[in-house]
């Protein structure tokens, strides 16, 4: 740790405080994440160390690079490449100006490329949200904290006791499915796509049941026809209200037909029928994709 000079605190992630730091030997600017674990008194679990070490091999232009893992004095520090801003901040800064559609399209395309790569290596994110999508001034967007959920779990609250957001959580997780797939990341990305277009969260639930019911009110209450096996899921209740599906043109009105088609496939209830990242990249919505540069208010 003595090789790094902390420049400033840049955020408070799910697992601990995040600093902008400089490598004293190379001058490289990095993001330094101190991981706080419940088990800190007994040290960092060896399983977590193994999981994290595997993530160092995950090299892709749309994945935030894990540069180093520093395990000292029962504490764990993760050294990542540094990017200028997260998507949550960028969307907030764009609340009145909007994010231009070509940039939304570019961001979605890049994120799908990152997901396709990770999913092909059987690595899931599990906790995609605007806060862990990072952008730079050149128009790139990258997935951060990939695989950390498997290593450390997804807590109900952060280390600062903030509630971990449910807004981007797939319905199969909310319904208690223990063995979920890469499709959970596609759902999350679909929610983020809709949010970039409409400038508001698609399903801003404040509890697990509120989250589920917000999804049901928009997409209709799922049944065995649209999602075989749903009624057998651990947290499914036959008493769930039966809401009808809304027309997608009412859900994301500013989005064109291709965009709505892609989004509806990303938000398919049945994880087995939900579009894959690889298939999504071939969707007609991306036939005119470019890579515009964002106007960042840093």
């Amino acid at each position: 740790m003595e090789n790094f000079q902390k420049v400033e605190k840049i955020g408070e992630g799910t697992y601990g405080v995040v600093y902008k730091a400089r490598n004293k030997l190379t001058g490289e600017v990095v993001a330094l994440k101190k991981i706080r674990l419940d088990t800190e008194t007994e040290g960092v679990p060896s399983t977590a160390i193994r999981e994290i070490s595997l993530l160092k091999e995950l090299n892709h232009p749309n994945i935030v690079k894990l540069l180093d893992v520093i395990h000292t004095e029962n504490k764990l520090y993760l050294v990542f490449e540094f990017l200028h801003q997260d998507l949550k901040k960028f969307m907030d800064a764009s609340a009145l100006t909007g994010i231009p559609l070509p940039l939304i399209k570019s961001y979605l395309f890049q994120l799908l490329q990152g997901l396709a790569f990770c999913h092909s290596h059987r690595v899931l994110h599990r906790d995609l949200k605007p806060q862990n999508l990072l952008i730079n001034t050149e128009g790139a967007i990258k997935l951060a904290d990939f695989g950390l959920a498997r290593a450390f779990g997804v807590p109900v609250r952060t280390y600062t006791h903030e509630v971990v957001t449910l807004w981007y959580r797939a319905p199969e997780i909310l319904l208690g499915c223990k063995y979920y797939s890469t499709a959970v990341d596609i759902w999350s990305l679909g929610c983020i796509f809709a949010e970039m277009v409409t400038r508001r969260a698609l399903f801003p639930g404040d509890s697990e049941i509120d989250q589920l019911f917000r999804i049901f009110r928009t997409l209709g209450t799922p049944d065995e026809v649209v999602w075989p096996g749903v009624t057998s899921m651990p947290d499914y209740k036959p008493s769930f209200p039966k809401w009808a599906r809304q027309d997608f043109s009412k859900v994301v009105p500013p989005l064109d037909e291709d965009g709505r088609s892609l989004l509806s496939q990303m938000l398919h209830y049945d994880p087995n029928k939900r579009i894959s990242a690889k298939a999504a990249l071939a969707h007609p919505f991306f036939q005119d994709v470019t890579k515009p540069v964002p106007h960042l208010r840093l």
Partner: antibody, heavy 117, light 106 residues
Framework: EVQLLESGGGLVQPGGSLRLSCAAS????????MSWVRQAPGKGLEWVSG????????YYADSVKGRFTISRDNSKNTLYLQMNSLRAEDTAVYYC??????????WGQGTLVTVSS | DIQMTQSPSSLSASVGDRVTITCRAS??????LNWYQQKPGKAPKLLIY???SLQSGVPSRFSGSGSGTDFTLTISSLQPEDFATYYC????????FGQGTKLEIK
């Protein structure tokens, strides 16, 4: 029920200052971007300024840039517009409005600002 | 900056008439176009958002259409309470209002 109540308007001399307030109730104020829109007597609507919800990014129409400052106090559920170096052409009814994504869904009743010597 | 041009600026019509107001943007704004109704001494009221979506509580005689640069607001059968001023507004990038269309009783 969503309510927005503007206050702070009145008569002020050219070059003077005024601070408008907008008290919000009936919704989670901190979750919404907010805007000020004005309407000169007998004229159309003109967007003046806006502020984002979470980080408080601010935006201004060119006509008020450098003279007006928008701010919010989420703990008090209140939106503000500090108006300095006022001109006769700033005379208008000032409305505060809630921004719901990409449209303004709720508006206050307005407060009249008159700039005259 | 995006300019919005509304036409006509004023319009006389009778109860029961079908009325159309048009709005043109100086550049493409996709479907980021909203319509508001304002009565004298009152605050504007949202009618239509995203070019064609009816705001909750607004009568179905109001409808909107268009995409890109050209948009229309249609009132299928005018009611006495519809006589007011109507404004279009783009929200593609910041906000710009049209100059308004005053709908008067013939």
């Amino acid at each position: 029920e969503v309510q927005l109540l503007e206050s702070g308007g009145g008569l002020v001399q050219p070059g003077g200052s005024l601070r408008l307030s907008c008290a919000a109730s009936g919704f989670t104020f901190s979750s919404y971007a907010m805007s000020w829109v004005r309407q000169a007597p007998g004229k159309g609507l003109e967007w003046v300024s806006g502020i984002s919800s979470y980080y408080g990014y601010t935006y201004y129409a060119d006509s008020v840039k450098g003279r007006f400052t928008i701010s919010r106090d989420n703990s008090k559920n209140t939106l503000y517009l500090q108006m300095n170096s006022l001109r006769a052409e700033d005379t208008a009814v000032y409305y505060c409005a809630r921004v719901y994504g990409y449209y303004m869904d709720y508006w206050g009743q307005g407060t009249l600002v008159t700039v005259s010597s | 900056d995006i300019q919005m041009t509304q036409s006509p600026s004023s319009l006389s019509a009778s109860v029961g008439d079908r009325v159309t107001i048009t709005c043109r943007a100086s550049q493409s704004i996709s479907s980021y176009l909203n319509w508001y109704q304002q009565k004298p001494g009152k605050a504007p009221k949202l009618l239509i958002y995203a070019a064609s979506s009816l705001q909750s509580g607004v009568p179905s005689r109001f409808s909107g259409s268009g995409s890109g640069t050209d948009f229309t607001l249609t009132i299928s059968s005018l009611q006495p309470e519809d006589f007011a001023t109507y404004y279009c507004q783009q929200s593609s990038s910041l906000y710009t209002f049209g100059q308004g269309t005053k709908l008067e009783i013939k």
